[in-house]
């Protein structure tokens, strides 16, 4: 099966490597413009130079392009946690992480929030905390999971998933109150 | 067809309460992120909260946290905001909205279905 090409891509395969299909002249091929620069104007003609310009602060094209303008800078989302890992260059987007003992929870394929990882008080590190993942806490006898920290079984209602897990505690709680003294 | 019905909506004094909800058909609920997001009286969207799928992360806009709680039951396809200590800055129309597929999704707008929406009124 043949991948569906867009009218661009369709173009631009006419032309060899590196080059794209002039739009007003399909006979001619102009060589792409270098990552850190963008299409100002196409060549001329062919073996002409294609006039290609740095793009301007605060924004940026990542790859051989002959784009009309550059691509904006993305901004860090405070309000999400973010933190800048590295500036925004002509040749490369802004890049956003999260701080060290944090990992990022992806609302969607690039909106992501940096949460703390769990420490696992009350329990053990089962796996550690990764970078798009938290920390997997194995508990301590008389503790149950519960979002992910590590809570007394005395908090375990019967209606619970904990009950399973608590079930000795709940019994040994159960012994000690029927055991009454004659 | 996806649907998203808001409830809870009306004219509340500033300081009151409100419960919003909204019930969710047409799609494996269980299987998504939620959120609230609000649109003020001639103003833009403005994300309130978001809640995962199974309700371990959640986000709040600097301008709700500690007033604003979300929650879910999936058992019911129903996703909830409790609004508390509410202000007339809070007035806007609130929407129900659905986390798009992880692929499709975009940074500026993450969400591909949204509700009708409900009326909040916050004034003397």
């Known amino acids: 099966l043949v991948p569906h090409l867009g009218d661009r891509e369709k173009r631009d395969s006419v032309c060899p490597q590196g080059k794209y299909i002039h739009p007003q002249n399909n006979s001619i091929c102009c060589t792409k413009c270098h990552k850190g620069t963008y299409l100002y104007n196409d060549c001329p003609g062919p073996g002409q130079d294609t006039d290609c310009r740095e793009c301007e602060s605060g924004s940026f094209t990542a790859s051989e392009n002959h784009l009309r303008h550059c691509l904006s800078c993305s901004k860090c989302r405070k309000e999400m946690g973010q933190v800048e890992i590295s500036s925004c260059t002509v040749d490369r987007d802004t890049v956003c992480g999260c701080r060290k003992n944090q990992y990022r929870h992806y609302w969607s394929e690039n909106l992501f929030q940096c949460f703390n990882c769990s420490l696992c008080l009350n329990g053990t590190v089962h796996l550690s905390c990764q970078e798009k993942q938290n920390t997997v806490c194995t508990c301590h006898a008389g503790f149950f999971l519960r979002e992910n920290e590590c809570v007394s079984c005395s908090n375990c209602k019967k209606s619970l998933e904990c009950t399973k897990l608590c079930l000795p505690q709940i019994e040994n709680v159960k012994g000690t109150e029927d055991s009454g003294t004659t | 067809e996806v649907q998203l019905l808001e409830s809870g909506g009306g004219l509340v004094q500033p300081g009151g309460s409100l419960r919003l909800s909204c019930a969710a058909s047409?799609?494996?609920?269980?299987?998504?992120?939620m959120a609230w997001v609000r649109q003020a009286p001639g103003k833009g969207l403005e994300w309130v909260s978001f809640?995962?799928?199974?309700?371990?992360?959640?986000y709040y806009a600097d301008s709700v946290r500690g007033r604003f709680t979300i929650s879910r039951d999936n058992s019911k396809n129903t996703l909830y905001l409790q609004m508390n200590s509410l202000r007339a800055e809070d007035t806007a129309v609130y929407y129900c909205?659905?986390?798009?597929?992880?692929?499709?999704?975009?940074?500026?707008?993450?969400?591909?279905?949204w509700g009708q929406g409900t009326l909040v009124t916050v004034s003397s």
């Open positions: 047409g799609f494996t609920f269980h299987k998504y992120g």
């Open positions: 809640i995962d799928l199974a309700g371990l992360h959640t």
């Open positions: 909205a659905k986390f798009a597929t992880y692929s499709s999704g975009n940074e500026e707008q993450p969400f591909d279905y």
